[in-house]
């Protein structure tokens, strides 16, 4: 797979971790969770042309019958290879509690 | 998540497993593969609706931000979540070998 | 590593049915290409192609013993069986499993020793 | 069913000879042909796969050729070990079958 910098479309356009600043309004999750007020959401975006950051085999087939059949296989996406924990203080019947979660902030990304 | 035949934008237009048919020639595998000569591809097309089969709380935010942000934040897409091994008749210097690649086939999709 | 290993009776009478068990290690039943075949050989004699499962449950037989035979496979225990019905002293032979890969025995596992006799 | 004929039945070579098999399909096969050897009191091993790719582990002395009706394996220089009985395979159609086996032996 080609160095993650490295992407053919132009610097940034390529799949990549990026930041977006959310809300709890904007999450949804106003009404249970307390803190933090805003989040600093990692998330992976951007295109995955031909190999770049392919993830495994499949994305490697992907990638070829993609070029073969644009509109009934669509190119690989660009998803999270691995999470960062992040923790939520909730509201409770009673008061709060700290919650951990595993499966809410991308690391790093690839394409599948 | 929604059951996975439960697709808001009509039937078989969400994230499913489907199967295409690709030849060596196709995969590009002609020149390191033997056998077989043709592959049923099991890949995850379709659409990733609204919490439809969300693979965990990134996509469930994913889907929240799209909603907010749709030209920065991509919709959750729809990518293996396990996958089914294979084994390939690999043509190496002196004749062949059996390898097996658990990562290949789609097993089953998710959203993220 | 591949390994098989075939398990029977040893010793059969005439009518009765034979049942054999192939136990396989290093490779999964359920991976896309792979099968088990059933091959036997009469002793000091040729090889016989008997039957084979697919990874996808297909199942092909010879035809000349089609009616006598059965096979099938448990994928959580590894395992494939041969089932033989109303056997013969001609049913009498070494009764291999082997891996397959697309249509060829790629691996053979030691062979069991059925014989048929009042 | 597909007839396999192999010959001879029997041959007897010396250490360091070239050793040819011959193996006759009763119909076009393509490439869809396998060669085993069987050591005394062994299981049989694959050798050759679609008629002349050696399989992993497969000594370089051994080699496989043809297409369509007729297919050969060809030792180049016969060594003590390679004392067994060969057989063809034909995958091409069910059911499988088997050439009747080439027995070689160590003058």
């Known amino acids: 797979a080609r160095n993650g910098d490295d992407c053919p479309l132009g610097p940034g356009r390529c799949c990549r971790l990026h930041t977006v600043r959310a809300s709890l309004e904007d999450l949804g999750w106003a009404d249970w969770v307390l803190s933090p007020r805003e989040v600093q959401v990692t998330m992976c975006i951007g295109a995955c042309p031909s190999q770049f950051r392919a993830a495994n085999m499949h994305a490697q087939i992907k990638t070829s019958l993609h070029r073969l059949k644009p509109d009934t296989v669509p190119a690989p996406c660009c998803v999270p290879a691995s999470y960062n924990p992040m923790v939520l203080i909730q509201k409770t019947d009673t008061g709060v509690s700290l919650q951990t979660y595993d499966d809410l902030l991308a690391k790093d990304c690839h394409c599948i | 998540a929604r059951n996975g035949d439960d697709c808001p934008l009509g039937p078989g237009r969400c994230c499913r497993l489907h199967t295409v048919r690709a030849s060596l020639e196709d995969l590009g595998w002609a020149d390191w593969v033997l056998s077989p000569r043709e592959v049923q591809v099991t890949m995850c097309i379709g659409a990733c609706p609204s919490q439809f089969r969300a693979a965990n709380m990134h996509a469930q935010i994913k889907t929240s931000l799209h909603r907010l942000k749709p030209d920065t934040v991509p919709a959750p897409c729809c990518v293996p979540a396990s996958y089914n091994p294979m084994v390939l008749i690999q043509k190496t210097d002196t004749g062949v070998s059996l390898q097996t690649y658990d990562d290949l086939l789609a097993k089953d999709c998710h959203c993220i | 590593q591949v390994q098989l290993q075939e398990s029977g009776p040893g010793l059969l009478k005439p009518s009765q049915t034979l049942s054999l068990t192939c136990t396989v290690s290093g490779f999964s039943l359920s991976t896309y290409g792979m099968g088990v075949g059933w091959i036997r050989q009469p002793l000091g004699k040729g090889l016989e192609w008997l039957a084979n499962?697919?990874?996808?449950?297909?199942?092909y037989y010879n035809s000349a013993l089609k009616s006598r035979l059965t096979i099938s496979k448990d994928t959580s225990k590894n395992q494939v069986s041969l089932k033989l019905s109303s056997v013969t002293a001609a049913d009498t032979a070494v009764y291999y499993c082997?891996?397959?890969?697309?249509?060829?025995?790629?691996?053979w596992g030691q062979g069991t020793l059925v014989t048929v006799s009042s | 069913d597909i007839q396999m004929t192999q010959s001879p039945s029997f041959l007897s070579a010396s250490v360091g000879d070239r050793v040819t098999i011959t193996c006759k399909a009763s119909q076009n096969m393509d490439t869809n042909v396998a060669w085993y050897q069987q050591k005394p009191g062994q299981p049989p091993k694959a050798l050759i796969y679609?008629?002349?790719y050696r399989y992993s582990g497969v000594p370089d002395r051994f080699s496989g050729s043809g297409s369509g009706t007729d297919f050969t394996l060809t030792i180049s220089s016969l060594q003590a070990e390679d004392v067994a009985v060969y057989y063809c395979?034909?995958?091409?159609?069910?059911?499988?079958?088997f050439g009747q086996g080439t027995k070689l032996e160590i003058k």
């Open positions: 395979q034909q995958y091409n159609s069910y059911p499988f079958t």
């Open positions: 499962i697919w990874w996808n449950d297909d199942k």
């Open positions: 082997a891996q397959m890969a697309y249509s060829w025995f790629a691996y």
């Open positions: 679609s008629a002349s």
